[in-house]
C-alpha cells in the first residue's frame, strides 16, 4: 500500500550533467543544457516528484511526473520506460506499482540518487546512449559502481 504525501519540483541530471527533459514525442531524454536553456525549456525540464508512504520499510517511494499540457507520469510497465497521461494517484492498494520508484541516496554520496523500480527489484532508471540520443531506460544493475544509474536531483521549489 502506498499513500501520497507531498510533492516537489525538481530538475534531474545524469552524472555527465545532462538534463532530463520530455521531448515533443513524450520521450524522456537527456541533453546538455545551460541553466538558462533549462529554464527556457520549462516545464519540459521540471519534474514533479511525489513522495509516498509505504506500508513496508523499503525506502522513499516516489512517482515522477511532468506537466506540459496535461500531467504525465513515468511508468516502467513491462520494463519499458514511458510517460503515461495520468495524475499520480493518492493511493495505490498494492505493494508494487509500475509508477512507484524507490529514491535511494548512494552511501557515501548523499547528493547522488538512484531510482529502483518497485515492480522489478534490482532494476533502476538509467541513462543510455542510443545513436545520438541519451535515453532514460530501466536497467538491471549489472556492475558495481555503475554511473549510468546515478542522478542528481535539484529541488526547484
Amino acid at each position: 500500500y502506498f499513500g501520497k504525501l507531498e510533492s516537489k519540483l525538481s530538475v534531474i541530471r545524469n552524472l555527465n550533467d545532462q538534463v532530463l527533459f520530455i521531448d515533443q514525442g513524450n520521450r524522456p531524454l537527456f541533453e546538455d543544457m545551460t541553466d538558462s536553456d533549462c529554464r527556457d525549456n520549462a516545464p519540459r525540464t521540471i519534474f514533479i516528484i511525489s513522495m509516498y508512504k509505504d506500508s513496508q520499510p523499503r525506502g522513499m517511494a516516489v512517482t515522477i511526473s511532468v506537466k506540459c499540457e496535461k500531467i504525465s507520469t513515468l511508468s516502467c510497465e513491462n520494463k519499458i520506460i514511458s510517460f503515461k497521461e495520468m495524475n499520480p494517484p493518492d493511493n495505490i492498494k498494492d505493494t508494487k506499482s509500475d509508477i512507484i520508484f524507490f529514491q535511494r541516496s548512494v552511501p557515501g554520496h548523499d547528493n547522488k540518487m538512484q531510482f529502483e523500480s518497485s515492480s522489478y527489484e534490482g532494476y533502476f532508471l538509467a541513462c543510455e546512449k542510443e545513436r545520438d540520443l541519451f535515453k532514460l531506460i530501466l536497467k538491471k544493475e549489472d556492475e558495481l559502481g555503475d554511473r549510468s544509474i546515478m542522478f542528481t536531483v535539484q529541488n526547484e521549489d
Epitope: 513522495m51 508512504k53 520499510p57 523499503r58 525506502g59 522513499m60 524507490f102 535511494r104 541516496s105 548523499d110
Partner: antibody, heavy 119, light 110 residues
Framework: EVQLVQSGAEVKKPGSSVKVSCKAS????????ISWVRQAPGQGLEWMGN????????YYAQKFQGRVTITADESTSTAYMELSSLRSEDTAVYYC????????????WGQGTLVTVSS | DIVLTQPPSVSGAPGQRVTISCSGS????????VNWYQQLPGTAPKLLIY???HRPSGVPDRFSGSKSGTSASLAITGLQSEDEADYYC???????????FGGGTKLTVL
C-alpha cells in the same frame, strides 16, 4: 557529510524510562529512516526499530513492541528513542543510525549513548 | 535470539586473505540483501558492504561481499593490522518483520 550527535550517558533505576536523542546536522533528515540499535556490554548488535521522519511511520522489533517509542522532530532534525519499564538487561550502548539508501542499510551512525540500569 | 550465524572469531597474518561467513535461512538471507558492518574497538559500527557486494565510497576494495542461497560471506584480502575489529552481517527477516544481525565475528590480525 551528515553527523549524528547523541545525548549523554544516563543512569536509571529499574522500572523507570529513558529518552535518548539523536540530532542530525549537515544533511537531509526528514525523508530517510532513523533506526535505533543497541549493544549490551560485550555483546552483538540488536535492532530496536526505526522511524521515517517525513511520514512519521514507525517500525518496531517484536521484542520491544509496547516498550519502545521512537519519535522525530523535523524542525530540529532530532530523533528520539524512549524505552520504558527498564530492567538491568537493558544496560547497553544505544546507537541511532541513519538509512539514506534503504531503511535497513545503516550508512551513518551516532557515537552511542550508554544507558546503565542499576538500583 | 540471533537469527544469522557467524563464527565467533577468525584470524590471519598481515597480507593474508580471510573470509567471514554468515548463515541464515530462506526467511532472511535467502530472499533479502545482506549488509556488513565493521566495528573497531570502542567505536560505533561502520557500513562496510551493502546490498550483498556494494562498497560505500571510502571503503577499500580489499573488502568484498558475496551471497549464495541462504549464506553470505565477507572477504578481506591483504590483511592489515587496522582491520582488527568485530564484523557483523545484517539482513531483513520477514518471519519476524525485523532486521536481524549476526552475532558478530572478532577478527584478529596475528
Amino acid at each position: 557529510e551528515v553527523q549524528l550527535v547523541q545525548s549523554g550517558a544516563e543512569v536509571k533505576k529499574p522500572g523507570s524510562s529513558v529518552k535518548v536523542s539523536c540530532k542530525a546536522s549537515g544533511g537531509t533528515f526528514n525523508s530517510y529512516a532513523i533506526s535505533w540499535v543497541r549493544q549490551a556490554p560485550g555483546q552483538g548488535l540488536e535492532w530496536m526499530g526505526n522511524i521515517i521522519p517525513m511520514t512519521g511511520q514507525t517500525y518496531y522489533a517484536q521484542k520491544f513492541q509496547g516498550r519502545v517509542t521512537i519519535t522525530a522532530d523535523e524542525s530540529t532534525s532530532t530523533a528520539y528513542m524512549e524505552l520504558s519499564s527498564l530492567r538491568s538487561e537493558d544496560t547497553a550502548v544505544y546507537y541511532c543510525a541513519r538509512a539514506a539508501y534503504h531503511p535497513l542499510v545503516f550508512d551513518n551512525w551516532g557515537q552511542g549513548t550508554l544507558v546503565t540500569v542499576s538500583s | 535470539d540471533i537469527v544469522l550465524t557467524q563464527p565467533p572469531s577468525v584470524s590471519g597474518a598481515p597480507g593474508q586473505r580471510v573470509t567471514i561467513s554468515c548463515s541464515g535461512s530462506s526467511s532472511n538471507i535467502g530472499n533479502h540483501y545482506v549488509n556488513w558492518y565493521q566495528q573497531l574497538p570502542g567505536t560505533a559500527p561502520k557500513l562496510l558492504i551493502y546490498r550483498n557486494n556494494h562498497r560505500p565510497s571510502g571503503v577499500p576494495d580489499r573488502f568484498s561481499g558475496s551471497k549464495s542461497g541462504t549464506s553470505a560471506s565477507l572477504a578481506i584480502t591483504g590483511l592489515q593490522s587496522e582491520d582488527e575489529a568485530d564484523y557483523y552481517c545484517q539482513s531483513w527477516d520477514y518471519s519476524g518483520f525485523s532486521t536481524v544481525f549476526g552475532g558478530g565475528t572478532k577478527l584478529t590480525v596475528l
